[in-house]
Interface confidence: medium
């Protein structure tokens, strides 16, 4: 089990580092988006794990961005960002087989309502229970 957890961590960290770099290979990214969405978490250890991902970086005040799957839907009543940005992207999390192009990458500023906690502990719990 410890070996499995180490392997999982390696895969996840690599997925985060390479997020969005290859539009033809998105299965791992979409799976990880699904994990974040379902477990209500963001990143492996912390949301800051996403800050190293070049394709998510904006400029200036938008330098820190994370995938939309990090967005805490229950924490906002901003219907504009929900309807126009978040929900259309999150709806695809139910259809993981669908291919995605880099232009479709949904990212939100870290300043918005994103999950506070990394996914490591939740995933490890899930592994222990299955």
């Amino acid at each position: 089990r410890a070996q499995l957890e180490r392997s999982l961590r390696d895969v996840v960290e690599k997925t985060i580092q390479k997020y969005g770099t290859n539009p033809e290979e998105t299965a791992a990214e979409e799976s990880w988006d699904y994990v974040q969405f379902q477990l209500r978490c963001c990143g492996w250890h912390y949301p800051q794990d996403w800050f190293q991902v070049l394709i998510l970086r904006g400029n200036g005040s938008e330098a820190h961005r994370v995938p939309c799957s990090c967005y805490n839907l229950s924490a906002t009543n901003d219907s504009t960002i929900l309807d126009k940005v978040i929900l259309p992207q999150l709806s695809r999390l139910g259809h993981l087989a669908r291919s995605r192009h880099s232009a479709d990458i949904c990212a939100v500023p870290a300043e918005s309502h994103i999950y506070r906690e990394g996914c490591a502990q939740g995933l490890q719990k899930w592994l222990h229970n299955n």
């Epitope: 250890h45 924490a75 870290a110 994103i114 506070r116 906690e117």
Partner: antibody, heavy 115, light 110 residues
């Protein structure tokens, strides 16, 4: 609401466990922080327990404190108290969203460590 | 390490005057900063979160501003009830931290 209990006079080296009882919200979706305040001093962050049960501690608090939880309580164990641990201990809720602040706070419980 | 430096440690203000308290983070914390008010014998109370958002029930004379590493709490039209100690706290990181709080600023109202 949030309420701490368990504070009392203890002798140095005697382990002490403080309890924070919560109502009106779920520990499954909220993180909880422990903060202390020595008499006449400022606020000092001790650590946090996340919704998943993962914990983080202030660098000075590692090994000196242990945070754990049940479905409705959060515990802070002071493993080997010294006189420097004399303080009022607060627990406070933090939401599940990054950037959430500490609210509400409990009234605090006083720990006095003296021989 | 995300150390928080708060200045001044104490300030006097006249009723109706303005108080400015500054908080500096040692690294960029985006806007993950909160301000608390604490009166003697009471727990801290949340005033402002996300650097500038007023907590529920907090009077509009309290204003938070700033982002990155520099933050300010301004109390305009100071009232005698504002006499308290004010603390800033970073909410950006809990990893390898000495303290998430600033050292506090005592506001004395004349």
């Amino acid at each position: 609401s949030v309420e701490e209990s368990g504070g009392r006079l203890v002798t140095p080296g005697t382990p002490l466990t403080l309890t924070c009882t919560v109502s009106g919200f779920s520990l499954s979706y909220n993180a909880m922080n422990w903060v202390r305040q020595a008499p006449g001093k400022g606020l000092e962050w001790i650590g946090i327990i996340f919704a998943s049960g993962r914990t983080d501690y202030a660098s000075w608090a590692k090994g000196r404190f242990t945070i754990s939880k049940t479905s409705t309580t959060v515990e802070l164990k002071i493993t080997s108290p010294t006189t420097e641990d004399t303080a009022t201990y607060f627990c406070a809720r933090e939401g599940s969203t990054w950037g959430d602040a500490l609210d509400p706070w409990g009234p605090g419980t006083l720990v006095t460590v003296s021989s | 390490a995300y150390d928080m430096t708060q200045t001044p440690s104490s300030v006097e203000a006249a009723v109706g005057g303005t108080v400015t308290i500054k908080c500096q983070a040692s690294q960029n914390i985006i806007d993950y900063l909160a301000w608390y008010q604490q009166k003697p014998g009471q727990p801290p109370q949340l005033l402002i979160h996300k650097a500038s958002t007023l907590a529920s029930g907090v009077p509009s004379r309290f204003k938070g501003s700033g982002s990155g590493t520099q933050f300010t709490l301004t109390i305009s039209g100071v009232q005698s009830d504002d006499a308290a100690t004010y603390y800033c706290q970073q909410g950006y990181s809990n990893s390898n931290i000495d303290n998430t709080f600033g050292g506090g600023t005592e506001v004395v109202v004349k």
